[in-house]
């Protein structure tokens, strides 16, 4: 019996087609992805093959203005339209709190939404009961397939699930649910979840009874053969893991942003054992036409976005200096504003010992593309912020050793004075440079804001200590020459859309007046 698994993950609000780098589509003839194009391909496969499941491994939420405006209603609407069969909860599904998950998505989805390792407690338990499930058995042709869900247990540090959801260890939570499926004589079981490729592989190895793992969170690109676009494969598709009980378990992920549709064909014997598995992600490029009915629906929903772009988010009573002349040479108040917003967006008081889990921000000055003038009645709009942060990136959480941070700050000024983008703006950091010294030895003081303290204060950076830092995904991926971050980071979790972070902060503060306050000094 043959099953076709179509899968997406980390779509992050890319409902419309995008450029090849998943930013805003500029030249339509070269654009990719989007739900209208995805639907065309899915329908084509559904027509051609008998047993097809369309699955999503989480993080539909967060990433573009679509999410900012529609807050998840767009996810439910278009996933229903595409007739997804199941979805696992990702960490970003909790970005607007539990209410922001329940109302727009859980109550509106016409497909099961899954996670076996999230347990509700207190008053939330009855409110959310039945709205998401640990697993679902789906009839496919004349057979049944069990789908069991899981979500990163780091979600409380990455999003806003509140205090009434407990995120358990994935493997511990999955095993009894898979065992339950076995008692129901379900002998074909897919683990669908959002904990990253390393955990996906561990689940394949450790959870008895799981036949296939469909993952997300780490934006992992797997491919067999010559890859069709810029993404470099982390391994073959499917990635085969040998389980502890000796089975070959295929593990798949489909990069991110709806650029690819994962396509995996599995052959099962009559006892539900995987005999063979093969496939590849399908690049959703312009050779695949956009479905006209879905496209028309997208255009209808778009109208509200255009109106939103020009609405006032808040006011500034000072000039927001985002000029290259400032932000690539010295501390600029636009950099301070953005870093403050980045930290504010990551406030998670999860432990009495820590006032917060993260206190530091770094931001490449070259990523700040425009100032905002206060003389336009102080008004700040989404449109203004899109000029400051036009690249559609995310502000991510990483863990780095102090020694890596020191290297990053040396890189920040290694060719100072040439208006290059690597000059770092900061938050929760005090840095002093001496430009008279040779490149690679210019950081003379580097103090960082403590987290394990009741009164935050600045202490010297310790080279061997592991620190959490918020930074643009561009830096996490080694952009602007920050190869040491990419090579040495100990953990990387994708965060929220950059503009969304800043716009939320401005809306919250209502009136802003960021200053230049001595975060970056030259001796």
């Amino acid at each position: 019996w043959e099953l076709t698994i179509l899968h997406t993950n980390d779509v992050h609000s890319r409902l419309e087609q995008t450029s090849e780098d998943s930013s805003k589509c500029v030249n339509a003839s070269r654009c990719m992805g989007g739900v209208a194009r995805l639907f065309t391909k899915v329908q084509q496969i559904r027509r051609a093959e008998p047993n097809v499941l369309l699955l999503d491994a989480g993080d539909q939420y967060q990433g573009t203005i679509w999410f900012t405006v529609y807050k998840g209603a767009e996810v439910a609407h278009f996933m229903n339209a595409l007739r997804y069969d199941a979805m696992a909860l990702g960490n970003h599904e909790f970005d607007n709190g539990v209410e922001g998950l329940i109302e727009p998505l859980l109550k509106e989805a016409k497909f099961p939404i899954l996670s076996a390792n999230i347990k509700a407690k207190g008053p939330l338990a009855s409110q959310i009961s039945g709205l998401y499930l640990p697993y679902k058995v789906l009839p496919v042709g004349d057979e049944v397939v069990g789908i069991v869900g899981y979500t990163s247990k780091e979600t409380p540090f990455l999003s806003n699930p509140g205090t009434n959801l407990v995120f358990e260890d994935e493997i511990t939570a999955l095993q009894p649910e898979v065992d339950k499926l076995k008692t129901l004589n379900v002998n074909k079981i897919i683990a669908l979840g959002h904990s990253g490729f390393e955990m996906d592989k561990l689940i394949a190895q450790k959870v008895r009874g799981v036949d296939v793992v469909v993952g997300g969170h780490s934006n992992t690109f797997l491919y067999t053969g010559n890859p069709p676009s810029k993404e470099v494969p982390a391994g073959k598709y499917p990635f085969i893991v040998t389980s502890d009980d000796g089975r070959k378990v295929p593990v798949v992920q489909a990069y991110a942003f709806g650029k690819y549709l994962g396509y995996l064909k599995i052959e099962f014997d009559e006892r539900g054992n995987v005999i063979s598995s093969h496939g590849n992600p399908i690049l959703l490029n312009s050779s695949i036409p956009e479905d006209p009915s879905i496209k028309a629906d997208i255009n209808k929903w778009r109208i509200k976005l255009d109106n939103y772009s020009t609405q006032e988010l808040g006011k500034t009573i000072v000039y927001l200096d985002g000029s290259s002349q400032s932000c690539r040479f010295r501390e600029c108040n636009m950099g301070n504003l953005i870093c403050d917003a980045m930290i504010n967006n990551n406030l998670r008081h999860t432990d009495e010992m820590f006032w917060n889990h993260v206190s530091m921000c770094i931001l490449n000055g070259g990523g700040i593309r425009s100032p905002i003038d206060e003389r336009n009645n102080g008004t700040i709009t989404w449109e203004n912020l899109a000029a400051v942060l036009p690249f559609g990136g995310t502000f991510d959480l990483v863990q780095l050793k102090g020694s890596t941070l020191k290297k990053a700050f040396e890189h920040s000024v290694h060719r100072y004075g040439q208006s290059t983008g690597e000059f770092l703006q900061v938050g929760g950091i005090h840095v002093v440079y001496d430009l008279s010294r040779k490149p690679g030895d210019r950081v003379v003081k580097l103090d960082v804001l403590c987290t394990k303290c009741r009164v935050p204060s600045y202490d010297p950076l310790k080279m061997d200590e592991v620190y959490k830092v918020i930074l643009p995904n561009f830096l996490a991926n080694g952009g602007d020459g920050f190869q040491m971050i990419k090579d040495e980071l100990l953990r990387h979790d994708s965060g929220d859309q950059d503009i969304n972070v800043v716009s939320t902060y401005i809306s919250k503060m209502k009136v802003i007046y960021p200053a230049v306050e001595g975060r970056i000094k030259f001796s």
Partner: antibody, heavy 119, light 107 residues
Framework: QVQLVQSGAEVKKPGASVKVSCKAS????????IHWVRQAPGQGLEWMGA????????SYNQKFKGRVTMTRDTSTSTVYMELSSLRSEDTAVYYC????????????WGQGTLVTVSS | DIQMTQSPSSLSASVGDRVTITCKAS??????LAWYQQKPGKAPKLLLY???SLETGVPSRFSGSGSGTDYTLTISSLQPEDFATYYC?????????FGGGTKVEIK
Amino acid sequence: QVQLVQSGAEVKKPGASVKVSCKASGYTFTTYNIHWVRQAPGQGLEWMGAIFPGNGHISYNQKFKGRVTMTRDTSTSTVYMELSSLRSEDTAVYYCARGDYDESYFDYWGQGTLVTVSS
Amino acid sequence: DIQMTQSPSSLSASVGDRVTITCKASEGIYNRLAWYQQKPGKAPKLLLYGVISLETGVPSRFSGSGSGTDYTLTISSLQPEDFATYYCQQYWSIPWTFGGGTKVEIK
């Protein structure tokens, strides 16, 4: 609306067999299990087994295995339960009930069929 | 098989009373618990599933709680139509099993 309509009462002699039917309507017949639950006079409820009409897959309570047969006719959306080698202690009301494949609580029940086993 | 032990087996109460019925499983059932109400000569009726989820159309005076092996059905203010027999059922492990029932009678 969802309805499960069962066949009428039966009187059988010990050693005989009885076949009870359950006709489903108001939902997609092939996507839910049909369970059989019995209740002896003045007693509690006892699950006998279930059939998944989509593929004919059957789960039994081991206590009844070998004596109970469950079949389905998708053309008429009907499920049948046959119990053989009847004994007096099989006298009970037999209910069919609908349940999810994966979460077997019973949201809709038939009206019940009284089977009396007496010599 | 998982044994479901219900207590009490019967109770007398008056209209307006708060009534609590307990159900204990012989092993953990991971919140896969349902409650049914049955009146004489009628089929059982689903009240709650997943411990706490109220079936559509069931009055909010019925509520459920518990975890692990111990579960409770509460009727916050007993109404005349609530006099019936109540059963719990586990659906974690085949064979699905019911409690022995609790008959709620008029005092």
